[in-house]
Each structure stands twice: as C-alpha cells, then as structure tokens.
C-alpha cells in the first residue's frame, strides 16, 4: 500500500508541494489522515497527520467544546493507494468571530497562542489579546494548554492559549480518537503565562495549611477549622457535538480530477477508531466562522478547498 505522508503544525508541513508518498510496511492495509482544528475567539489553527495507519477503513467526525474553545476532529482511513488526501487541512484566516473590532473588550486580558510553535508560546512571549463576550457567552478567563494529535505512529502537539469562559478550570480536557485538547484556566490579567503546574485547589476552597512544628513545649494549638482538605479532580465535562453529514459520491476518475472540487466517498465506521458512524463533510477542518451559531458547529463554513488551494 502507498500512502501520502506529512505532519502539519498550524499551517505548515502538509502544505502544497510538500506532500510525500510512502510505501507502507507488511500488514499495513490502511492509509490514514487525521486533522484537529482549534478555534479561539481570536483565531484558529489545525494540526494534521497523514501516513500509513492501522485499523479499519472509515471516517469519524467530532466537534468538541472546552469552556468556549472549540475543537473539531476528523479522522479518515482508507484502503486504496494514496487515498488519504481527502480531508481539508486549510483554515480560513479567521474573521475573528465575525469582525473583532465590533466587540467591546470586557476587561480581561490573556496571552494568545493560536498556531504558534512551543518556542514562540513561552511565558510572556506570545501576543496579548483583549477578551470580549461573544454569542451571549462571557469570556473572562484565560487558558493555557495543548492540543495533541496522534495518528500514523506520529504525535504532533501545539500550545493553545486564549480567552475562555471558565476562570478556574484545572487540567480539563476534551478528547476524540487520538485527539486531546486540555489545559487549565485562570483569572486575572495575563495570568496564563504558565498553568502547567496548576493544582486542583479552587480559590473558593481554603487549602490545607501546614503549620510549622511548635518551637516551645507548650501544647500545640490546632488551626481553627482544620478539616483536612483533600484535592480531588472535578469531573471534566466533555461536550461532543457529532455531525453526521451526507456522503458525496465521487464520479471522477482518479487520473482526471477537477482541482476546484474534490468530493469524498462516504464510509461509516463500524466500531473502529471512535465508534461514531458519521461521514466527514466537505470542508470540515476549519469548523464554522460565526460564533453565534454554536449549535451548527462544526459547520460547512470552513475551508472548502481540496487539501489546499481555494474553491
């Protein structure tokens, strides 16, 4: 089996001209491509992998919401030579939730990493953005986390920072098959420089205070109200918005394709990678553009071009 091979971080790596073909090893009978897109109120980006895979042919398509950070995951596996270039890897340069200048800053200020490398998203290096409320949702918290995609024996990860709805979340995450968006939230100006070591203590729960040992022989005085506080992880809430779309049959011969429109064959997963039997619609990777249509996410408003190039 011969498959396309590439790894994309933000908008580089699976760009046009950079596509490679690889011969898969014995026993490998599927080509795979996976794309994970993340949208903040200030922009969006994607990570993607193409290569020789494992499992069964089929498609999976899932939308996720983590405190107002939207994620869209697509997985496509197929068993023909070089069949793994059907998903969209291009995003629109975000109309920031419409026209950002039309939004009133709400006073919150966060570091923003949208498609930035780990080197450019360290500490106070990334750009600072003013948060605003969108679609009736209040974005007053800051987020620091990562998006990770694993497919074709490759793991690609990028940092994510920006404005979110929650101000106290700790190590929260949403997942799809081989896809994770996780991190922590905080409150206060530019508080999301580094939340990797944030503990589960909430500001509303007094932490366990360890008193130093008594220095005199006097009887030790117990701290008032010293009920021991055990930090337990609050259950993470994962909203999975699954969008099965109608498959589009391809009537084009493999050697004569119109570069403007490439249609996708439909396939449903029978308990494979993620267990949801939807088929990926054309142009999913970018998700939607309008934050007011939350129930439509992920919609067809994203990039609708063949793997790169415009439609």
């Amino acid at each position: 089996l011969e498959c396309y091979s590439c790894v994309q971080k933000a908008d580089d790596g699976c760009s046009p001209h950079r596509m490679k073909t690889v011969k898969c090893g014995p026993g490998v009978d599927v080509c795979t491509e996976a794309v994970g897109a993340v949208e903040t109120i200030h922009g969006q980006f994607s990570v993607a992998v193409r290569g020789c895979g494992s499992g069964i042919p089929g498609k999976n398509d899932r939308g996720l919401d983590l405190h107002g950070l939207l994620a869209f995951f697509q997985l496509q596996q197929c068993s023909e030579d070089r069949c793994n270039a059907k998903l969209n890897l291009t995003l629109r340069g975000l109309n920031p939730a419409g026209n950002e200048s039309a939004y009133e800053p709400n006073g919150a200020e966060c570091y923003s990493c949208v498609g930035l490398s780990r080197e450019k998203c360290q500490g106070s290096m990334p750009p600072v953005v003013n948060c605003y409320n969108a679609s009736g949702r209040v974005y007053k918290g800051c987020f620091d986390g990562n998006v990770t995609l694993t497919a074709a024996n490759v793991t690609v990860s990028l940092p994510v920072r920006g404005c979110v709805q929650d101000e106290t979340c700790t190590r929260d995450g949403v997942t799809g098959p081989g896809f994770t968006l996780s991190g922590s939230c905080c409150q206060g100006p530019r508080c999301n420089a580094d939340l990797r070591n944030k503990t589960y203590f909430s500001p509303r729960i007094p932490p366990l205070v360890l008193l130093p040992p008594p220095t005199t022989a006097a009887p030790s005085t117990r701290a008032q109200n010293s009920s021991s506080t055990t930090s337990t992880a609050a259950p993470t809430t994962t909203t999975s918005i699954i969008k099965p779309t109608t498959a589009q049959a391809s009537h084009t011969s493999p050697h004569e394709m119109d570069l403007e429109v490439i249609q996708e064959e439909g396939a449903s997963l029978s308990g494979g990678a993620a267990g949801h039997g939807g088929t990926a619609g054309h142009g999913g990777a970018a998700g939607h553009q309008d934050r007011s249509n939350m129930e439509k996410y992920p919609g067809k408003g994203g990039a609708q071009i063949p793997a790169k190039g415009g439609s």
């Epitope: 046009p16 001209h17 070089r82 570069l259 071009i305 063949p306 793997a307 790169k308 439609s311």
Partner: antibody
Framework: EVQLLESGGGLVQPGGSLRLSCAAS????????MSWVRQAPGKGLEWVSY????????YYADSVKGRFTISRDNSKNTLYLQMNSLRAEDTAVYYC??????????WGQGTLVTVTS | QSVLTQPPSASGTPGQRVTISCTGS?????????VHWYQQLPGTAPKLLIY???KRPSGVPDRFSGSKSGTSASLAISGLRSEDEADYYC???????????FGGGTKLTVLG
C-alpha cells in the same frame, strides 16, 4: 472563473525597489497558499517565494532572501512582493501562482521587471 | 544549473510518442515528494499539466501521462500534435532548499 492579475512591474535601476501586486478573484483567496515564480528572458522557471493562507508561514529562495518580502492582504484578496536592492539578474517576468493540489494550479499572466542602468 | 535535470530539447512527428525525463536527487524526488509537470506555450504563462506524479487536471487530454520511480520522473505524450509544441517543466519540493524546485525545461518541437 479563477483569475490572478499581476501589476507593478517596470523599469528600475540596480539597487532600486519595486512592489508587485497580484489581485485574486474567483476563489477563496484566504484559503490558498500563494507563490511568486519568475522567468528570466529566454530562461526557465524559478520559484521565488511562498506564503501560507494565513500569512504566518513564509519561504524564500536563497537568491532573494533578505531582499524580497512576500505578504498578503486577505481582506483585499491581494498578494504582494516587495523587491528591494534589485540586481540585473532579477530581471524577469514575475508570475503570481496559486497553490492547488500540491502544485501551482493557477497562474497569472505575469508582469515584467527590468533592472538596468 | 537547475536542481532537477531535464533534456533541453525533444522532438517528434505528429502521432508519435515522446517522453521527457526529469532527474532529481535524494532531497527532492528521491525523498518521496510528488512531481508535477507544467506546459508553457509560446508567449503565455505556464499551465499545470500533471500533478501528484500521474494525475491530470480536468481539461488535460489523456494523451499526457506522468510517472515516477526512485529519483526520477517522466512525462509521456502520445499521439503528438502540433499544438503540443511548447516548453515543459517538472517540479518538486526540495528539502535542502526548503522550497519547490523546477527542472530547466524541455523545448518540444513537433516536426513536419
């Protein structure tokens, strides 16, 4: 119909500057990687520079690195090439090209840049 | 000196089959990158002829075909016609140069 229309070429002295523009229409410009490719008179094609759909990833050929700057304005559907410190060997027809399915699938008609004293 | 090597010229008579070669190295074609072919008719801009080694954009006749093996690729034109007289260029990504590279071009002449 997809169209790419270059402008801004002309006659310039060595060491001078020019700014080329490429107006795009008929497709979603903000989704497309774009490139500049040039062709010296009677010679072959030479790739010059490459910019991602959002503008955050950029590549240059070694021959123009540090002198040329590619940029784009997605709100105006326009691609630019700022050319500084021009040399005689930069004389060429400059084509704006769209990145399609891993290839330059649409080309403009080209604009001629002549560097001479 | 182009990174991809093509013969400077090729010729054939109408109806004949002509093949144009394109030789690269381990940093481009040999690295697995796909090869594209462009046709440039006299006085016009280049046009995509073959992409992804052997695929044709819509509108390109099936007389044109591409193939790739190892560090080289080739373009075959069967049933040669006078309107095929043009310059033909191959292209691929190059890891060392971090950009797409072109062959030097092959001028195809249709005799008679």
């Amino acid at each position: 119909e997809v169209q790419l229309l270059e402008s801004g070429g002309g006659l310039v002295q060595p060491g001078g500057s020019l700014r080329l523009s490429c107006a795009a229409s008929g497709f979603t410009f903000s989704n497309a990687w774009m490139s500049w490719v040039r062709q010296a008179p009677g010679k072959g094609l030479e790739w010059v520079s490459y910019i991602s759909s959002s503008g955050s990833t950029i590549y240059y050929a070694d021959s123009v690195k540090g002198r040329f700057t590619i940029s784009r304005d997605n709100s105006k559907n326009t691609l630019y090439l700022q050319m500084n410190s021009l040399r005689a060997e930069d004389t060429a027809v400059y084509y704006c090209a769209r990145e399609g399915l891993w290839a330059f699938d649409k080309w403009g008609q080209g604009t001629l840049v002549t560097v001479t004293s | 000196q182009s990174v991809l090597t093509q013969p400077p010229s090729a010729s054939g008579t109408p109806g004949q089959r002509v093949t144009i070669s394109c030789t690269g190295s381990s940093s481009n074609i040999g690295a697995g990158y796909v090869v594209h072919w462009y046709q440039q008719l006299p006085g016009t801009a280049p046009k995509l002829l073959i992409y992804d080694n052997n695929k044709r954009p819509s509108g390109v006749p099936d007389r044109f075909s591409g193939s790739k093996s190892g560090t080289s690729a080739s373009l075959a034109i069967s049933g040669l016609r006078s309107e095929d007289e043009a310059d033909y260029y191959c292209a691929a990504w190059d890891d060392r140069l971090n950009g797409p590279v072109f062959g030097g071009g092959t001028k195809l002449t249709v005799l008679g």
